[in-house]
């Protein structure tokens, strides 16, 4: 029985439109059918939840309607996208994976992905 392990990239640069995508991959000790993925942001030792989704293996991730996250799953791999990011949102984004069903429950937490967000320069005023 292999241990639960979560892997995610160390660094990701958000696009100029404030979108960052990264893969959260987990090694599963068992055959999970229900998985919960949570994205957490750590800044100044404070950890806050960014978004969370529970999905059945083989089905799409469903985040809440007002969530800034979207995602797709393929096997033990989750492709996460966070939108609407600004420079102040730069920080460590941690992927937390919980194998909810069948028993037993397992917890896995990644080391975090440092997401850098640079606000785009405002367009210079034209003379026209």
């Amino acid at each position: 029985c292999k241990a639960m392990h979560v892997a995610q990239p160390a660094v990701v640069l958000a696009s100029s439109r404030g979108i960052a995508s990264f893969v959260c991959e987990y090694a599963s000790p068992g055959k999970a059918t229900e998985v919960r993925v949570t994205v957490l942001r750590q800044a100044d030792s404070q950890v806050t939840e960014v978004c969370a989704a529970t999905y059945m293996m083989g089905n799409e991730l469903t985040f809440l309607d007002d969530s800034i996250c979207t995602g797709t799953s393929s096997g033990n791999q989750v492709n996460l996208t966070i939108q609407g990011l600004r420079a102040m949102d730069t920080g460590l984004y941690i992927c937390k994976v919980e194998l909810m069903y069948p028993p037993p429950y397992y917890l896995g937490i990644g080391n975090g992905t440092q997401i850098y967000v640079i606000d785009p320069e405002p367009c210079p005023d034209s003379d026209f």
């Epitope: 639960m4 957490l40 939840e49 529970t54 028993p103 037993p104 397992y106 917890l107 937490i109």
Partner: antibody, heavy 118, light 107 residues
């Protein structure tokens, strides 16, 4: 601030039932797993049960499986523990606790004493 | 199920002493190990989560280390308010078992 307040403890005869409640406030209840942990007089901590998020996933210690039922009402910010077929060895202080955002039980109630005695 | 053991079961120490408590899991739990402090008649208090992360508001004299099966809680300089019982707990997999506890009392 986060607050957890247990109620429902008392003295009950072996074989009878009791229902414990835990009123939560100061946080978004539905985003956290909730646990029951107990402590027999003069003994250590024993994990009893957990219920996750929407209430669909519940897990129990072997010692209470089939007798205790954990439930939650996210609309009322309430956690419950229905205890049936109580035994003398269930005598303990029962604590409700919140699962931390990463791991660990980060907030605990003050506890409620359950005494099973004839 | 994962079994947790602690040593010693009790220890006597003086104010200012460096105190070390160990916790061992019967199988690997990665770093999903938490430490709690409990004083008589009170609810437990989370000190350390994820093996080495200090819970908000906990004094920096408390520290945790370890990974896999072997973990340590260290109090660098014991203070009068630290005399209590300390428990480890694994949160890797259900059932979330606690260690039997270590009572720290005054020498």
């Amino acid at each position: 601030q986060v607050q957890l307040v247990e109620s429902g403890g008392g003295v009950v005869q072996p074989g009878r039932s009791l229902r414990l409640s835990c009123a939560a406030s100061g946080f978004t209840f539905s985003r956290y797993g909730m646990h029951w942990v107990r402590q027999a007089p003069g003994k250590g901590l024993e994990w009893v049960a957990v219920i996750w998020y929407d209430g669909n996933n519940k897990y129990y210690a072997d010692s209470v499986k089939g007798r205790f039922t954990i439930s939650r009402d996210n609309s009322k910010n309430t956690l419950n523990l229905q205890m049936n077929s109580l035994r003398a060895e269930d005598t303990a202080v029962y604590y409700c606790a919140r699962a931390g955002i990463l791991t660990g039980l980060d907030y605990w109630g003050q506890g409620t004493l359950v005494t099973v005695s004839s | 199920d994962i079994q947790m053991t602690q040593s010693p079961s009790s220890l006597s120490a003086s104010v200012g002493d460096r105190v070390t408590i160990t916790c061992r899991a019967s199988q690997s739990i990665s770093s999903y190990l938490n430490w709690y402090q409990q004083k008589p008649g009170k609810a437990p208090k989370l000190l350390i989560y994820a093996a080495s992360s200090l819970q908000s508001g906990v004094p920096s004299r408390f520290s945790g280390s370890g990974s896999g099966t072997d973990f340590t809680l260290t109090i660098s300089s014991l203070q009068p308010e630290d005399f209590a019982t300390y428990y480890c707990q694994q949160s890797y997999s259900t059932p979330f078992t606690f260690g039997p506890g270590t009572k720290v009392d005054i020498k």
